[in-house]
Amino acid sequence: GIAIPRNSGCPNSEDKNFPRTVMVNLNIHNRNTSTNPKRSSDYYNRSTSPWNLHRNEDPERYPSVIWEAKCRHLGCVKADGNVDYHMNSVPIQQEILVLRREPRHCPNSFRLEKILVSVGCTCVTPIVHHVA
Amino acid sequence: GIAIPRNSGCPNSEDKNFPRTVMVNLNIHNRNTSTNPKRSSDYYNRSTSPWNLHRNEDPERYPSVIWEAKCRHLGCVKADGNVDYHMNSVPIQQEILVLRREPRHCPNSFRLEKILVSVGCTCVTPIVHHVA
C-alpha cells in the first residue's frame, strides 16, 4: 500500500462522502504493448500541412510535458515546395484527460482534467463565404 | 459522478492497503471552457487526406466512447477530386490516458490505461526507398 504521512488540509481518502471520487490504480496498463509506435514519427516535416511541436510543461499536471502542434503555414505546401494559399493548414485537435493534484501538494488526491491539444495539422479546402 | 450499483467482490475504496491507488475526483474540470470548439469540426471531409470517424465504445472504460479516425484513401485528394497516389494519407496518432474499471463492473475502482488513438489524417510525401 501507500504509506504517506497525511497532510493537513488534504482530503481523507477513507471518507465515504468524498465527493464524486473513485479509487484509481496508477500502475498504467499499456494497451499497445506489441509495438513501440513512433506515433506520428516525422509526419510533421513530410506533411503538406507541416507543423512544429512546442513543449507545454506543467509540473503539477500528469503528464507534465505535452507536445503541442502549431501549423507552420496558413496555406499548404505544394510539390514544388511553395505554399498554396488557396488551401489551409489547420490543427487537428483532441480533448485528452490529464491528472492534476487537488488540493495542490496533496500526495494521494487528484482530479481529472480535460484539455484540448493540437496533435498535428491537415490540409483542407477553405470555406468560401460569398458576399451577396 | 458515476452512479453504478456496487458489485460484491469489488475492492473497498476505504481500504488503506488498496494497491498503488489514489483518490481521483471525477468531477472533470475543463480547461477549455471559454469556447466549445467543434474541435476538428468538418475537417475530416474537407481535408486532402479525408478520414472517417469510427465509434469505439467500451462501457468498462472512461471515456466510454472514443472516435477513431481511419483514412479514406491511400493517396491524397487533388483539387479536381481525384486521388493522387504519389502522396500518402496517414493517420496522426496520439497516446492518451483513459480509466478502465478494474475489477470489471466495479463502480468505484479504476486503473489508468494508455491507448493509442488515431485523431485524424494528414497528407505526406512518401519515403521512397531506392533499390541498389
Epitope: L26, R39, Y44, R55, D58, P63, S64 | E95
Partner: antibody, heavy 124, light 109 residues
C-alpha cells in the same frame, strides 16, 4: 539492440574544455521518442544529471542549473552521435561521465541505455 | 531543485533476506517519473524500476517498487548474491530538474 559508445580524452587541464562524444547504434539521435543525456558520477557529488537534447521538429536543450553557463550538448545527425562540451573546467569536474538514452514517452521518463562511462580527470 | 534522500545509506544483509530501501522526495513528485537503478563497482547504472512500480525488461520478479507523493520504496524480496550493489532513485520533475538520490549500498553481512 541499442548501444552507446563513448569516446574522448581522460585528462583535461584546468580552465580548458572537456569534450566527449557518444555514438549511437540501433537508434537515431533524431528519434521523436527519446532524449539523449549526460550524467556524471564523482565520490563527492554522487550521480549528477548534466543535461539532455531531444528532437521534436526542432532541437530542445535542457541543462542542469549547476552547469548551465558552461555546458553545450550538440547532436551530429550525419554521424548519429551527440557530444558534451564543458567549458572552464576545474578539479571539481573530475568524474566518470556517462551518456544515456532517456525514454521520453510523455508518460514515463527514465534512462534505459547507458554508455560505458569515461573517467575524466581535471589536472595540470 | 527537489532533493531525494535515500535511507539507509548502507544496508547489511545476508543472502535470502528481504531488503527494503527508501527514497523520500523533498516535495511531491509524480510516481510515473520516478525510477530505480542498480550499480555495481566499475559498471554503469542499470535500470530496475520505472514509473515507481514497473519492472524494466529482464529484471527479476524479486525486485518491486511502490510509493506515491514523497515516499517511495524499492523492495528485494529475497537477496541473491548478485543483488549486492548500490541502488539509486531518480526523478524528473520539470525542466531542467532531474535529480538522483545519494544511493543505498546493500552489502553482505
Amino acid at each position: 539492440q541499442v548501444q552507446l559508445q563513448q569516446s574522448g580524452p581522460g585528462l583535461v587541464k584546468p580552465s580548458q574544455t572537456l569534450s566527449l562524444t557518444c555514438a549511437i547504434s540501433g537508434d537515431s539521435v533524431s528519434s521523436s521518442s527519446a532524449a539523449w543525456g549526460w550524467i556524471r558520477q564523482s565520490p563527492g557529488r554522487g550521480l549528477e544529471w548534466l543535461g539532455r537534447i531531444s528532437y521534436r521538429s526542432k532541437w530542445y536543450n535542457d541543462y542542469a542549473v549547476s552547469v548551465k553557463s558552461r555546458i553545450t550538448i550538440n547532436p551530429d545527425t550525419s554521424k548519429n552521435q551527440f557530444s558534451l562540451q564543458l567549458n572552464s573546467v576545474t578539479p571539481e569536474d573530475t568524474a566518470v561521465y556517462y551518456c544515456a538514452r532517456e525514454v521520453d514517452s510523455t508518460y514515463y521518463s527514465y534512462f534505459d541505455i547507458w554508455g560505458q562511462g569515461t573517467l575524466v580527470t581535471v589536472s595540470s | 531543485d527537489i532533493v531525494l534522500t535515500q535511507s539507509p545509506a548502507t544496508l547489511s544483509l545476508s543472502p535470502g533476506e528481504r531488503a527494503t530501501l527508501s527514497c523520500r522526495a523533498s516535495q511531491n513528485v509524480w510516481a510515473f517519473y520516478l525510477a530505480w537503478y542498480q550499480q555495481k563497482p566499475g559498471q554503469a547504472p542499470r535500470l530496475l524500476i520505472y514509473g515507481a512500480s514497473n519492472r524494466a525488461t529482464g529484471v527479476p520478479a524479486r525486485f518491486s517498487g511502490s510509493g506515491s507523493g514523497t515516499d517511495f520504496t524499492l523492495t528485494i524480496s529475497s537477496l541473491e548474491p548478485e543483488d549486492f550493489a548500490t541502488y539509486y532513485c531518480t526523478q524528473y520533475y520539470s525542466s531542467p530538474s532531474l535529480t538522483f538520490g545519494q544511493g543505498t549500498k546493500v552489502e553482505i553481512k
